[in-house]
């Protein structure tokens, strides 16, 4: 069932089919023979009670109170009254655009991030039995889709699909053709969530070690789910049987994004080890960051100034 | 539109330099790195390397090591590759493509190193 | 570093019919902390780039039609035309961007029987 028109102040556009619907419809079913009102109220007019001898424009169903169509001079306040329950709305109608598919004031604004699902559907459930046939446009030009009942677009964003886009409904009731438009203006963003990743720590790390004890490097990182982080040692990783890279630890952060460690665990130093870089790297699609480990002999200390050392 | 925009074709001797440039347009330059990717006659495609428009961080294919140089201008938008001491078999044609994978591509210069 | 080897170098397949191309990494292209595979597929007709048509070797990119599908994980992936239409003879490219330096398998040529 279509939900009731909750929202106080609405704003249609002349000619199109439209209707109210008060929110205590499940309650008047149970009180049928409670009396049921409409009424409209506009300028010096005060309360007006509406039946279908007001207009022939106007039809009333249990719930619900149509226009066949709505027109500039139903602009006002329309109220619902059953015993003690009363509804408001003020109904605002506004001219049409002739020069256009749509009425700007009447669009739908949505952002999309490129690359992110997009999904347009035409489908108008209220109206639903009485629609021939449905048509969306882009700009104002017919785009040519498989369903002509509920035309559908369901893609991954791209730039080129920004635009207006335009729901319209084609019926008949009572031998008349109508139409019921509805537009979204699509704006394709660029995707806002990733950051730019971020290695923690100076780009250039030297480590005081011993011969024949184990050290391990830890490289962190913040950064998106789709980054990598690795690390990258000698000619060819894994030629080193004393070199092991521990597995990726990931927390998640606040904000969606992740916080990334990982180690390398280099056991029983040897000469070979020293001196030589443990490049740590972070990639993105946006590129790389690498920082870069150095294993110095504690003997050796003195010979770099004391800032440059980590643990 | 979002596009990726490269310098004409060049003729070059064995021995010269030539410095290829890739204008982006229609996107935030900095979100992407920008990969070089070449393509000989009647060849597969290869990877160069890249270079971060957020960092200027580049990343070669060890083969090119000591020849190429990536630049990038975020004032402009702008990548540059340039390939040096440039030798008969650098003949191809070479795309500017952005992201790790290529989603965007330049339409390609071709370079053609002939005495 | 990674090598992709595409299989076959050469196929020739019936329009309507289903074309299947493989490529293999040398090492996996699985990154275990967030499940994802690190391969791509591009379709590259005579004198102009390639495009991109799957990416996280999956997802489609948007706007190639849906007879397009990759699938695979680790080190083995399929690229698969589910009814091949004349605008589809290209060469067809496999490419990993899980390590530096990002590579392509050596192209499969795909033609009309």
């Known amino acids: 069932a279509e939900s009731c028109t909750s929202r106080p102040h609405i704003t249609v556009v002349e000619g199109e089919p439209f209707y109210l619907k008060h929110c205590s419809c499940s309650l008047a079913h149970e009180i049928e023979t409670t009396t049921k009102s409409w009424y409209k109220s506009s300028g010096s007019q005060e309360h007006v009670e509406l039946n279908p001898r007001s207009s022939s424009r106007i039809a009333l169903h249990d719930c619900v109170l149509e226009f066949w169509p709505v027109e500039l001079n139903d602009t006002g306040s329309y109220f619902f009254q059953m015993k003690n329950y009363t509804q408001k709305w003020k109904l605002n109608v506004i001219r049409r655009n002739k020069h256009s598919c749509f009425t700007e004031r009447q669009v739908t604004s949505k952002i999309v991030e490129v690359k992110k699902f997009f999904q347009i559907t035409c489908e108008n459930s209220y109206y639903q039995t009485l629609v021939n046939s449905t048509s969306l446009y882009k700009n104002c030009k017919k785009l040519l889709l498989e369903n002509n009942k509920n035309p559908t677009i369901k893609k991954n964003a791209e730039f080129e699909d920004q635009g207006y886009y335009s729901c319209v409904h084609f019926l008949h009731h009572n031998g008349k053709l109508f139409n019921i438009t509805k537009t979204f203006n699509i704006t394709i963003v660029e995707d806002r969530s990733n950051i730019v990743p971020v290695l923690l720590g100076p780009k250039l790390n030297h480590v005081a070690v011993e011969l024949g004890k184990n050290v391990r490097l830890n490289c962190s990182a913040l950064l998106n789910e789709e980054d990598v982080i690795y690390w990258m040692f000698g000619e060819e990783n894994g030629s080193d049987p004393n070199i092991h890279e521990e597995k990726e630890m990931r927390i998640m952060t606040p904000e969606g994004k992740w916080h990334a460690s990982k180690v390398l665990r280099i056991e029983n130093i040897g000469e070979s080890n020293l001196n030589v870089l443990y490049n740590c790297t972070v990639a993105s699609t946006g590129g790389t960051d690498t920082k870069s480990f150095i294993l110095v002999r504690k003997a050796d200390m003195a010979d770099i100034p004391g800032h440059v050392f980590t643990r | 539109q979002v596009q990726l925009v490269q310098s004409g074709a060049e003729v070059k001797k064995p021995g010269a330099s030539v410095k290829v440039s890739c204008k982006a347009s229609d996107y935030t330059f900095t979100t992407y790195g920008i990969s070089w990717v070449r393509q000989a006659p009647g060849q597969g495609l290869e990877w160069m390397g890249w270079?971060?428009?957020?960092?200027?961080?580049?990343n070669y294919a060890q083969k090119l090591q000591g020849r190429v140089t990536m630049t990038t201008d975020t004032s402009t938008s702008t990548a540059y590759m340039e390939l040096r001491s440039l030798r008969s078999d650098d003949t191809a044609v070479y795309y500017c493509?952005?992201?790790?994978?290529?989603?965007?591509w330049g339409r390609g210069t071709l370079v053609t190193v002939s005495s | 570093d990674i090598v992709m080897t595409q299989s076959p170098d050469s196929l020739a397949v019936s329009l309507g019919e289903r074309a299947t191309i493989n490529c293999k990494s040398s090492?996996?292209?699985?990154?275990?902390?967030?499940?994802?595979?690190?391969l791509a597929w591009y379709q590259q007709k005579p004198g102009q780039p390639p495009k991109l048509l799957i990416y996280?070797?999956?997802t489609r990119e948007s706007g190639v039609p849906d007879r397009f599908s990759g699938s695979g994980s680790g080190t083995d992936f399929t690229l698969t035309i589910s009814s091949l239409q004349a605008e589809d003879v290209a060469v067809y490219y496999c490419q990993q961007y899980y390590r530096t330096p990002y590579s392509f398998g050596q192209g499969t040529k795909l033609e009309i029987k």
């Open positions: 270079i971060s428009a957020y960092n200027g961080n580049t």
């Open positions: 493509a952005r992201g790790w994978y290529f989603d965007l």
């Open positions: 996280w070797a999956s």
């Open positions: 090492q996996s292209v699985l990154y275990s902390s967030n499940n994802k595979n690190y």
